[in-house]
């Protein structure tokens, strides 16, 4: 019987509000033994895959997806999935990347810490939430 794969988690360094032209790194985490991590934006059809997987702890592996110079087109909802043979996991929660014009003001920090791992509430009417998952065989429209 195939094991039930835990859902991955996703976070962003240094945060989820990034000034135009700055860098951001998405960190996807899953169990040990992951062969491929996939970072999706908005839809399964827009993704990047990596097999550059490192061990983050004895029970956890991770992959890092870096965008060197963030553009407005990088804004959106991101999530991770992974492939641990012989199957794909379910999707992580979504993480929203906001791209803002640099203000440089001392009282307004450029970034906010961002991660998305646990369950979220069902969207209320004013929710700024949306939903999507893992996929094989779709043509990649690369993120960056």
């Amino acid at each position: 019987q195939e094991e039930d794969l835990p859902r991955p988690s996703i976070s962003a360094e240094p945060g989820t509000v990034i000034p135009l032209g700055s860098h951001v790194t998405f960190v996807c985490r899953g169990p040990v033994g992951v062969q491929t991590f996939r970072l999706e934006r908005d839809s399964r059809s827009t993704y990047n895959d990596t097999e550059d997987v490192s061990q983050a702890s004895p029970s956890e592996s991770e992959a890092r997806f870096r965008i060197d110079s963030v553009r407005e087109g990088n804004a959106g909802l991101y999530r991770c999935i992974y492939y641990k043979p012989p199957k794909w996991s379910e999707q992580s929660d979504y993480l929203e990347l906001l791209v803002k014009e640099s203000s440089g003001g001392p009282d307004s920090p450029d970034t906010e810490p961002g991660s998305s791992a646990g369950p979220t509430q069902r969207p209320s009417d004013n929710s700024h939430n949306e939903h999507a998952p893992a996929s094989q065989g779709l043509k990649a429209e690369h993120l960056y």
């Epitope: 979504y94 979220t120 996929s135």
Partner: antibody, heavy 119, light 107 residues
Framework: EQSVESGGGLVQPEGSLTLTCKAS????????ICWVRQAPGKGPEWIAC???????TYYASWAKSRFTISKTSSTTVTLQMTSLTAADTATYFC??????????????WGPGTLVTISS | ELVMTQTPASVEAAVGGTVTIKCQAS??????LAWYQQKPGQPPKLLIY???TLESGVPSRFSGSGSGTEFTLTISDLECADAATYYC?????????FGGGTELEIK
């Protein structure tokens, strides 16, 4: 709070039409809006989506050449349709799509607007 | 393009009984699946999202399961009001594909 479609009606074959999805009591900020149609006696058929978080548009392969989804304001999304044929006769729905965790939630549907293509 | 195959196309069941509707995705869609109920002249009504999460206000007689490519909707303790057409849908905004529907008749 609701979304309402308008702009349907009777159109001649090869004609064009623009449908509007208007939010009432909320704006579409950071949601996605999708258009779905349903021909008489048939099942729903996805047409296109507009993502407010990324400003990206997504289309069913059959719809790409004749349908255009656009955001016209924070409370309005339109669907432009060209070269219409009898096969496009259907009720057209817009749906507001939120997120729940890592999955999308198509929870709010308008009542639909009927488009009839006939000479 | 992703295809959602729904079975059976129609089913008849008795009040108080149980029905199971299956939906198969042509590619792995993880948990991105919703189930809808539709009655004539109305838009689809969301019953279940994320494959197994019950929409607010929907009776617990409705349940969903599955992940990846195989999904199931189960309706137990059937009532006359459950007579309708049921659809599965891939909820990804880049796909949005619906199954062909299952017409449920209550006898």
């Amino acid at each position: 709070e609701q979304s309402v479609e308008s702009g349907g009606g009777l159109v001649q074959p090869e004609g064009s039409l623009t449908l509007t999805c208007k939010a009432s009591g909320f704006d579409f900020s950071r949601n996605a809006i999708c258009w779905v149609r349903q021909a008489p006696g048939k099942g729903p058929e996805w047409i296109a989506c507009y993502s407010f978080s990324s400003s990206a548009t997504y289309y069913a392969s059959w719809a790409k050449s004749r349908f255009t989804i656009s955001k016209t304001s924070s409370t309005t999304v339109t669907l432009q349709m060209t070269s219409l044929t009898a096969a496009d006769t259907a009720t057209y729905f817009c749906a507001r799509v939120d997120i729940y965790g890592g999955s999308r939630y198509w929870g709010m549907w308008g009542p639909g607007t009927l488009v009839t293509i006939s000479s | 393009e992703l295809v959602m195959t729904q079975t059976p196309a129609s089913v008849e069941a008795a009040v108080g009984g149980t029905v199971t509707i299956k939906c198969q995705a042509s590619q792995n869609i993880g948990g991105d699946l919703a189930w809808y109920q539709q009655k004539p002249g109305q838009p689809p009504k969301l019953l279940i999202y994320r494959a197994s999460t019950l929409e607010s206000g929907v009776p617990s007689r409705f349940s969903g399961s599955g992940s990846g490519t195989e999904f199931t909707l189960t309706i137990s303790d059937l009532e006359c009001a459950d007579a309708a057409t049921y659809y599965c849908q891939d909820t990804d905004i880049g796909s949005g594909a619906f199954g062909g529907g299952t017409e449920l008749e209550i006898k």
